[in-house]
Interface confidence: low
Amino acid sequence: HTAAQDNCTCPTNKMTVCSPDGPGGRCQCRALGSGMAVDCSTLTSKCLLLKARMSAPKNARTLVRPSEHALVDNDGLYDPDCDPEGRFKARQCNQTSVCWCVNSVGVRRTDKGDLSLRCDELVRTHHILIDLRHRPTAGAFNHSDLDAELRRLFRERYRLHPKFVAAVHYEQPTIQIELRQNTSQKAAGDVDIGDAAYYFERDIKGESLFQGRGGLDLRVRGEPLQVERTLIYYLDEIPPKFSMKRLT
């Protein structure tokens, strides 16, 4: 199905406008901001979601990176250029002609420049590290229960193939979820790890993108898992290119 037929809504993206004007009167949904048709049987790309959310307040994060080539989304929200498939265009610019290159999750991977800046290809983010800190609980969660619950969540809620959840690490109160997906591993129809991570990030913040579903109620053996801090690191297949000035 492309969208819920009964009331013509998009189960996987509430930031859409839907109407029964598809072939044969089928429900068709278009993303706000871009007007692009979306497939409501799967996650909408992060680029189209950011475009729909362009007027939302800025969200910046600045904690220490876990490796020299990991990227953190310090720039927050911007109105991105998306290609006809809904992916980020390799080069993004703001309305005052400041341009930069991004990776496949839309995070800046070069210094900022002007219109003469070239971004020859969209570099794939193949490794995402989601770093969570949970609120204090009576005791630590059982690691294998936590692992199983988070894998189930990514499989069922975000439709991410289990093979892309590389590992779940736990050292109370820190949980780390590793998502890995090389270009060669991603088959047609596979959810992108960047899109799954973005949906998860929004769920954790209580800003679910799903239509009509309640917020994320994460429980491990019945015990609520409440996240008080999230930090996401992105590792690209080709290391980012920042000047030494930025790195110091």
Epitope: D83, P84, C93, N94, Q95, T96, D114
Partner: antibody, heavy 121, light 107 residues
Framework: QVQLVQSGAEVKKPGASVKVSCKAS????????MQWVRQAPGQGLEWMGW????????KYAEDFKGRVTISADTSTSTAYLQLSSLKSEDTAVYYC??????????????WGQGTLVTVSS | DIQMTQSPSSLSASVGDRVTITCKAS??????VAWYQQKPGKAPKLLIY???YRYTGVPSRFSGSGSGTDFTLTISSLQPEDFAVYYC?????????FGQGTKLEIK
């Protein structure tokens, strides 16, 4: 509606300078870039440079660096192109054109009527 | 600099014909290509931007397609007012560059 009105035709001697103006109306001047393009008689279009009217910063094509100055007066919504050390090959129609600022907006949606500059001794 | 090569440089056609003009970029310019129409003694007019988007007020008989290095402007059914010179332009990177033009004449 959006309009760009350019100054009148000019005849100049080799080595002289010319300054062409382009007055914008129908939109907020500082929300769009102003580009300059020229067209020699019977020839194609050649981009000369532009000014970011928001920041006031110009950028020039390599072939014109050192000879061209692009400026803007936001109080009168007017952009200017000054070309110095004129040569006979600079005889052309000079156009101003409005563009956007962001990465996908560097096409020219509104053009001035053009100003013919003739360089002749 | 990115070279934009148009073909053909001139072409003769009749009212009602379907006409295609192509533009080849010397490097990948994504979908950042615009098409303009220019009539004698007049400024160019924007027809298509970002390869396939028709500008406001441009008749639906004009369409554009392509990405990367190869782009096409198609006029589905020529009208008398369509005889003019057509230019492509890459709006991906400075210096902004134009094709040399295609003169569309009445057969």
């Amino acid at each position: 509606q959006v309009q760009l009105v350019q100054s009148g035709a000019e005849v100049k001697k080799p080595g002289a300078s010319v300054k062409v103006s382009c007055k914008a109306s129908g939109y907020t001047f500082t929300t769009a870039g102003m580009q300059w393009v020229r067209q020699a008689p019977g020839q194609g279009l050649e981009w000369m440079g532009w000014i970011n009217t928001h920041s006031g910063v110009p950028k020039y094509a390599e072939d014109f660096k050192g000879r061209v100055t692009i400026s803007a007066d936001t109080s009168t919504s007017t952009a200017y192109l000054q070309l110095s050390s004129l040569k006979s090959e600079d005889t052309a129609v000079y156009y101003c054109a409005r563009s956007g600022f962001g990465s996908s907006y560097w096409y020219f949606h509104v053009w001035g009527q053009g100003t013919l500059v003739t360089v002749s001794s | 600099d990115i070279q934009m090569t148009q073909s053909p440089s001139s072409l003769s056609a009749s009212v009602g014909d379907r006409v295609t003009i192509t533009c080849k970029a010397s490097q990948d310019v994504s979908t950042a290509v615009a098409w303009y129409q220019q009539k004698p003694g007049k400024a160019p007019k924007l027809l298509i931007y970002s390869a396939s988007y028709r500008y406001t007020g441009v008749p639906s008989r004009f369409s554009g397609s392509g990405s990367g290095t190869d782009f096409t402007l198609t006029i589905s059914s020529l009208q008398p007012e369509d005889f003019a010179v057509y230019y492509c332009q890459q709006h991906y990177i400075t210096p902004l560059t134009f094709g040399q033009g295609t003169k569309l004449e009445i057969k």
